[in-house]
Protein backbone atom coordinates (compact mmCIF):
# COMPACT_ATOMS: atom_id res chain seq x y z
CA UNK A 1 0.00 0.00 0.00
CA UNK A 2 1.21 3.50 -0.85
CA UNK A 3 2.45 5.84 1.87
CA UNK A 4 0.40 8.82 3.01
CA UNK A 5 2.03 12.08 4.12
CA UNK A 6 0.16 14.80 6.03
CA UNK A 7 1.18 18.42 6.51
CA UNK A 8 -0.71 21.62 7.39
CA UNK A 9 -2.38 23.53 4.58
CA UNK A 10 -1.19 26.99 5.63
CA UNK A 11 1.59 28.43 7.83
CA UNK A 12 2.49 32.05 8.43
CA UNK A 13 6.20 32.78 8.81
CA UNK A 14 7.32 34.84 11.79
CA UNK A 15 8.47 38.44 11.42
CA UNK A 16 12.02 37.06 11.50
CA UNK A 17 11.35 34.92 8.42
CA UNK A 18 11.04 31.59 10.21
CA UNK A 19 8.34 29.04 9.40
CA UNK A 20 7.75 25.71 11.14
CA UNK A 21 5.41 22.85 10.32
CA UNK A 22 4.96 19.17 11.07
CA UNK A 23 5.24 16.50 8.40
CA UNK A 24 3.70 13.19 9.42
CA UNK A 25 3.83 9.96 7.46
CA UNK A 26 1.99 6.69 7.82
CA UNK A 27 4.77 4.16 7.44
CA UNK A 28 3.56 0.97 5.72
CA UNK A 29 6.83 -0.82 6.57
CA UNK A 30 9.45 -0.95 9.30
CA UNK A 31 11.94 1.53 7.86
CA UNK A 32 15.32 2.06 9.48
CA UNK A 33 16.50 4.80 7.09
CA UNK A 34 14.29 7.71 6.08
CA UNK A 35 14.95 10.66 3.80
CA UNK A 36 12.95 13.86 4.17
CA UNK A 37 12.99 16.51 1.45
CA UNK A 38 11.32 19.89 1.37
CA UNK A 39 10.31 20.95 -2.13
CA UNK A 40 9.01 24.34 -3.25
CA UNK A 41 6.44 24.51 -6.03
CA UNK A 42 5.94 27.78 -7.86
CA UNK A 43 4.35 28.19 -11.30
CA UNK A 44 4.47 24.40 -11.81
CA UNK A 45 8.25 24.47 -11.27
CA UNK A 46 9.50 22.29 -8.42
CA UNK A 47 12.82 22.92 -6.68
CA UNK A 48 14.53 21.27 -3.74
CA UNK A 49 14.81 23.49 -0.67
CA UNK A 50 16.62 21.03 1.59
CA UNK A 51 16.97 17.35 2.34
CA UNK A 52 18.12 15.14 5.20
CA UNK A 53 18.50 11.42 5.74
CA UNK A 54 18.19 9.92 9.19
CA UNK A 55 18.16 6.57 10.92
CA UNK A 56 14.97 5.85 12.85
CA UNK A 57 15.53 6.76 16.48
CA UNK A 58 18.24 9.26 15.62
CA UNK A 59 18.00 12.97 14.92
CA UNK A 60 17.77 14.18 11.37
CA UNK A 61 20.65 16.39 10.31
CA UNK A 62 20.56 18.85 7.45
CA UNK A 63 23.77 20.11 5.86
CA UNK A 64 25.45 22.98 7.69
CA UNK A 65 24.60 25.48 4.95
CA UNK A 66 20.94 24.39 4.79
CA UNK A 67 18.13 26.85 5.55
CA UNK A 68 16.26 23.96 7.19
CA UNK A 69 16.49 22.39 10.61
CA UNK A 70 14.36 19.65 12.05
CA UNK A 71 13.66 17.06 14.69
CA UNK A 72 12.08 13.64 14.35
CA UNK A 73 9.87 11.64 16.64
CA UNK A 74 8.55 8.33 15.38
CA UNK A 75 6.72 8.95 12.10
CA UNK A 76 6.64 12.69 12.63
CA UNK A 77 9.15 15.30 11.50
CA UNK A 78 9.15 18.88 12.79
CA UNK A 79 10.59 21.09 10.07
CA UNK A 80 11.78 24.69 10.38
CA UNK A 81 12.76 26.86 7.43
CA UNK A 82 14.61 30.09 8.16
CA UNK A 83 15.79 33.13 6.26
CA UNK A 84 12.50 33.48 4.40
CA UNK A 85 11.56 36.68 2.58
CA UNK A 86 8.26 37.79 1.06
CA UNK A 87 9.43 36.55 -2.34
CA UNK A 88 9.74 33.04 -0.85
CA UNK A 89 5.99 32.83 -0.25
CA UNK A 90 4.81 29.63 -1.91
CA UNK A 91 3.83 26.00 -1.59
CA UNK A 92 6.31 23.88 0.37
CA UNK A 93 5.91 20.13 -0.12
CA UNK A 94 7.10 17.49 2.30
CA UNK A 95 8.50 14.41 0.57
CA UNK A 96 9.29 11.30 2.61
CA UNK A 97 11.19 8.28 1.30
CA UNK A 98 11.65 5.04 3.19
CA UNK A 99 15.09 4.13 1.91
CA UNK A 100 15.92 0.95 3.81
CA UNK A 101 15.20 -1.90 4.08
CA UNK A 102 13.45 -2.71 0.81
CA UNK A 103 10.89 -2.10 -0.48
CA UNK A 104 11.35 1.62 -1.06
CA UNK A 105 8.29 3.77 -0.34
CA UNK A 106 7.58 7.29 -1.57
CA UNK A 107 5.22 9.70 0.14
CA UNK A 108 4.46 13.24 -0.99
CA UNK A 109 2.32 15.65 0.99
CA UNK A 110 -0.18 18.07 -0.53
CA UNK A 111 2.03 20.99 0.46
CA UNK A 112 1.99 23.78 3.01
CA UNK A 113 1.36 27.29 1.73
CA UNK A 114 3.87 29.44 3.60
CA UNK A 115 3.14 33.15 3.67
CA UNK A 116 6.06 35.44 4.37
CA UNK A 117 5.59 39.15 5.06
CA UNK A 118 8.71 41.31 5.14
CA UNK A 119 8.78 43.43 8.32
CA UNK A 120 8.27 47.16 7.97
CA UNK A 121 11.56 49.02 8.41
CA UNK A 122 11.85 50.77 11.75
CA UNK A 123 11.19 54.51 11.43
CA UNK A 124 14.17 56.78 12.00
CA UNK A 125 14.14 58.27 15.49
CA UNK A 126 14.84 61.95 15.96
Amino acid sequence: KAMHVAQPAVVLASSRGIASFVCEYASPGKATEVRVTVLRQADSQVTEVCAATYMMGNELTFLDDSICTGTSSGNQVNLTIQGLRAMDTGLYICKVELMYPPPYYLGIGNGTQIYVIDPEPCPDSD
Epitope: K1, A2, M3, H4, E33, R35, T37, L39, V46, T47, E48, A51, T53, K95, E97, M99, Y100, P102, P103, Y104, Y105, L106, G107, I108
Partner: antibody
Framework: GVVEPGRSLRLSCTAS????????MHWVRQAPGKGLEWVAV????????HYADSAKGRFTISRDNSKNTLYLQMNSLRAEDTAVYYC???????????WGQGTLVTVSS | QSPGTLSLSPGERATLSCRAS??????LAWYQQKPGQAPRPLIY???SRATGIPDRFSGSGSGTDFTLTISRLEPEDFAVYYC?????????FGPGTKVDIK
Protein backbone atom coordinates in the same frame (compact mmCIF):
# COMPACT_ATOMS: atom_id res chain seq x y z
CA GLY B 1 26.68 -4.21 -28.28
CA VAL B 2 26.57 -7.94 -28.92
CA VAL B 3 27.69 -10.28 -26.15
CA GLU B 4 27.70 -14.07 -25.80
CA PRO B 5 25.53 -15.82 -23.21
CA GLY B 6 27.25 -16.16 -19.84
CA ARG B 7 29.50 -13.16 -20.43
CA SER B 8 29.47 -9.77 -18.70
CA LEU B 9 28.87 -6.22 -19.87
CA ARG B 10 28.91 -2.82 -18.19
CA LEU B 11 26.60 -0.05 -19.35
CA SER B 12 27.20 3.58 -18.52
CA CYS B 13 25.05 6.69 -18.69
CA THR B 14 26.57 10.15 -18.30
CA ALA B 15 24.22 12.93 -17.24
CA SER B 16 24.46 16.67 -17.68
CA UNK B 17 22.41 19.78 -16.99
CA UNK B 18 21.39 18.98 -13.41
CA UNK B 19 22.91 18.27 -9.99
CA UNK B 20 23.41 14.54 -10.47
CA UNK B 21 23.93 13.71 -6.77
CA UNK B 22 20.50 15.16 -5.85
CA UNK B 23 18.57 12.58 -7.88
CA UNK B 24 17.89 8.88 -7.83
CA MET B 25 18.70 7.15 -11.12
CA HIS B 26 17.00 4.14 -12.70
CA TRP B 27 17.68 1.56 -15.36
CA VAL B 28 14.65 0.44 -17.41
CA ARG B 29 14.81 -2.09 -20.22
CA GLN B 30 12.65 -2.99 -23.19
CA ALA B 31 12.95 -6.29 -25.02
CA PRO B 32 12.36 -6.11 -28.79
CA GLY B 33 8.65 -5.54 -29.46
CA LYS B 34 7.81 -5.71 -25.76
CA GLY B 35 6.89 -3.30 -22.98
CA LEU B 36 8.95 -1.42 -20.41
CA GLU B 37 10.50 -3.31 -17.49
CA TRP B 38 12.05 -1.55 -14.51
CA VAL B 39 15.47 -3.02 -13.65
CA ALA B 40 17.09 -1.13 -10.78
CA VAL B 41 17.41 2.18 -8.96
CA UNK B 42 20.26 3.81 -7.06
CA UNK B 43 19.57 6.67 -4.69
CA UNK B 44 21.49 9.93 -4.23
CA UNK B 45 24.85 9.06 -2.64
CA UNK B 46 24.69 5.45 -3.86
CA UNK B 47 24.22 3.84 -0.46
CA UNK B 48 20.75 2.50 -1.27
CA UNK B 49 19.92 0.32 -4.26
CA HIS B 50 16.83 -1.63 -5.18
CA TYR B 51 16.46 -4.27 -7.90
CA ALA B 52 13.76 -6.06 -9.85
CA ASP B 53 13.65 -9.80 -9.15
CA SER B 54 14.97 -10.46 -12.66
CA ALA B 55 18.11 -8.43 -11.89
CA LYS B 56 18.89 -9.60 -8.35
CA GLY B 57 22.16 -11.47 -8.05
CA ARG B 58 23.30 -10.83 -11.63
CA PHE B 59 23.08 -7.07 -12.11
CA THR B 60 24.73 -4.34 -10.03
CA ILE B 61 23.80 -0.68 -10.27
CA SER B 62 26.35 1.94 -9.22
CA ARG B 63 27.14 5.61 -9.71
CA ASP B 64 30.09 7.98 -9.66
CA ASN B 65 28.76 11.39 -8.64
CA SER B 66 32.10 13.04 -9.35
CA LYS B 67 31.75 11.95 -12.99
CA ASN B 68 27.94 12.37 -13.22
CA THR B 69 27.80 8.78 -14.41
CA LEU B 70 25.46 5.87 -13.77
CA TYR B 71 26.50 2.25 -14.37
CA LEU B 72 24.88 -1.15 -14.76
CA GLN B 73 27.16 -4.16 -14.42
CA MET B 74 25.47 -7.17 -16.01
CA ASN B 75 26.88 -10.64 -15.34
CA SER B 76 25.89 -14.14 -16.51
CA LEU B 77 23.95 -12.67 -19.41
CA ARG B 78 21.13 -14.65 -20.98
CA ALA B 79 19.28 -14.39 -24.27
CA GLU B 80 16.28 -12.97 -22.40
CA ASP B 81 18.39 -9.99 -21.30
CA THR B 82 18.40 -8.80 -24.93
CA ALA B 83 16.80 -5.37 -24.79
CA VAL B 84 17.24 -1.65 -25.13
CA TYR B 85 18.45 -0.36 -21.76
CA TYR B 86 17.44 3.15 -20.77
CA CYS B 87 18.72 5.25 -17.90
CA UNK B 88 16.10 7.53 -16.38
CA UNK B 89 16.10 10.19 -13.69
CA UNK B 90 13.83 9.94 -10.67
CA UNK B 91 12.35 13.43 -10.64
CA UNK B 92 11.82 15.40 -7.46
CA UNK B 93 8.18 14.28 -7.46
CA UNK B 94 9.11 10.64 -8.04
CA UNK B 95 8.16 9.94 -11.65
CA UNK B 96 10.80 9.27 -14.30
CA UNK B 97 11.13 12.74 -15.77
CA UNK B 98 14.16 12.44 -18.09
CA TRP B 99 15.25 9.41 -20.10
CA GLY B 100 18.44 8.57 -21.96
CA GLN B 101 18.30 7.58 -25.61
CA GLY B 102 18.86 3.90 -24.80
CA THR B 103 21.52 1.29 -25.54
CA LEU B 104 20.76 -1.94 -27.36
CA VAL B 105 22.23 -5.03 -25.73
CA THR B 106 22.03 -8.24 -27.74
CA VAL B 107 22.89 -11.52 -26.02
CA SER B 108 23.54 -14.13 -28.68
CA SER B 109 26.02 -16.84 -29.54
CA GLN C 1 -3.84 -1.74 -19.12
CA SER C 2 -6.68 -1.86 -21.60
CA PRO C 3 -7.30 -2.08 -24.40
CA GLY C 4 -4.11 -3.55 -25.89
CA THR C 5 -4.72 -1.64 -29.13
CA LEU C 6 -7.00 1.28 -29.83
CA SER C 7 -7.73 2.09 -33.48
CA LEU C 8 -8.96 5.66 -33.91
CA SER C 9 -8.96 8.51 -36.41
CA PRO C 10 -7.36 11.92 -35.96
CA GLY C 11 -9.73 14.26 -34.15
CA GLU C 12 -11.33 11.46 -32.15
CA ARG C 13 -11.19 11.07 -28.37
CA ALA C 14 -8.99 8.34 -26.89
CA THR C 15 -9.64 6.80 -23.48
CA LEU C 16 -6.98 4.48 -22.06
CA SER C 17 -7.41 2.54 -18.82
CA CYS C 18 -4.96 1.31 -16.24
CA ARG C 19 -5.86 -0.88 -13.27
CA ALA C 20 -3.46 -1.53 -10.39
CA SER C 21 -3.52 -4.73 -8.34
CA UNK C 22 -3.51 -2.66 -5.14
CA UNK C 23 -3.90 1.01 -4.26
CA UNK C 24 -1.08 3.19 -5.59
CA UNK C 25 -2.59 6.37 -4.13
CA UNK C 26 -1.51 9.27 -6.34
CA UNK C 27 1.81 7.80 -7.50
CA LEU C 28 0.69 7.00 -11.02
CA ALA C 29 2.32 8.27 -14.22
CA TRP C 30 1.66 7.92 -17.94
CA TYR C 31 4.38 7.80 -20.61
CA GLN C 32 4.24 8.02 -24.39
CA GLN C 33 6.64 6.10 -26.59
CA LYS C 34 7.09 6.35 -30.35
CA PRO C 35 9.03 3.77 -32.40
CA GLY C 36 12.79 4.06 -31.95
CA GLN C 37 12.46 6.67 -29.22
CA ALA C 38 12.75 6.73 -25.44
CA PRO C 39 9.53 7.10 -23.45
CA ARG C 40 8.54 10.60 -22.43
CA PRO C 41 6.44 11.51 -19.40
CA LEU C 42 2.95 12.87 -20.05
CA ILE C 43 1.18 12.75 -16.69
CA TYR C 44 2.37 12.31 -13.11
CA UNK C 45 0.56 12.28 -9.79
CA UNK C 46 -2.51 10.87 -11.62
CA UNK C 47 -3.53 14.18 -13.20
CA SER C 48 -0.62 16.66 -13.43
CA ARG C 49 0.79 17.31 -16.88
CA ALA C 50 4.56 17.06 -17.28
CA THR C 51 6.48 20.01 -18.70
CA GLY C 52 5.54 20.88 -22.26
CA ILE C 53 2.60 18.47 -22.53
CA PRO C 54 -0.43 19.96 -24.32
CA ASP C 55 -3.73 20.21 -22.47
CA ARG C 56 -5.47 17.72 -24.74
CA PHE C 57 -3.83 15.10 -22.50
CA SER C 58 -5.50 14.59 -19.13
CA GLY C 59 -5.34 11.99 -16.39
CA SER C 60 -7.87 10.95 -13.78
CA GLY C 61 -8.70 8.21 -11.31
CA SER C 62 -7.87 7.10 -7.79
CA GLY C 63 -6.93 4.04 -5.77
CA THR C 64 -6.60 1.29 -8.36
CA ASP C 65 -8.41 2.61 -11.47
CA PHE C 66 -6.89 5.28 -13.68
CA THR C 67 -7.61 6.82 -17.07
CA LEU C 68 -5.60 8.74 -19.64
CA THR C 69 -7.73 10.79 -22.01
CA ILE C 70 -6.61 12.43 -25.24
CA SER C 71 -9.44 14.81 -26.05
CA ARG C 72 -8.70 15.21 -29.77
CA LEU C 73 -6.12 12.97 -31.39
CA GLU C 74 -3.43 14.73 -33.39
CA PRO C 75 -1.33 12.81 -35.95
CA GLU C 76 1.67 12.91 -33.57
CA ASP C 77 -0.33 11.22 -30.78
CA PHE C 78 -0.35 7.79 -32.45
CA ALA C 79 2.07 5.87 -30.23
CA VAL C 80 2.24 3.39 -27.36
CA TYR C 81 1.18 4.58 -23.89
CA TYR C 82 2.32 3.06 -20.60
CA CYS C 83 1.06 3.63 -17.08
CA UNK C 84 3.44 3.18 -14.15
CA UNK C 85 3.26 3.21 -10.38
CA UNK C 86 6.25 4.85 -8.72
CA UNK C 87 5.25 4.83 -5.05
CA UNK C 88 6.70 1.46 -4.06
CA UNK C 89 9.57 -0.63 -5.41
CA UNK C 90 9.52 -2.51 -7.71
CA UNK C 91 8.28 0.31 -9.94
CA UNK C 92 5.92 -1.49 -12.28
CA PHE C 93 4.77 -0.51 -15.77
CA GLY C 94 1.57 -1.59 -17.42
CA PRO C 95 1.85 -3.70 -20.61
CA GLY C 96 1.03 -0.67 -22.76
CA THR C 97 -1.75 0.45 -25.07
CA LYS C 98 -1.02 1.07 -28.72
CA VAL C 99 -3.04 3.88 -30.28
CA ASP C 100 -2.96 3.44 -34.04
CA ILE C 101 -4.63 5.07 -37.02
CA LYS C 102 -7.93 3.54 -38.07
Amino acid sequence: GVVEPGRSLRLSCTASGFTFSSYGMHWVRQAPGKGLEWVAVIWYDGSNKHYADSAKGRFTISRDNSKNTLYLQMNSLRAEDTAVYYCARAGLLGYFDYWGQGTLVTVSS
Amino acid sequence: QSPGTLSLSPGERATLSCRASQSVSSYLAWYQQKPGQAPRPLIYGVSSRATGIPDRFSGSGSGTDFTLTISRLEPEDFAVYYCQQYGISPFTFGPGTKVDIK
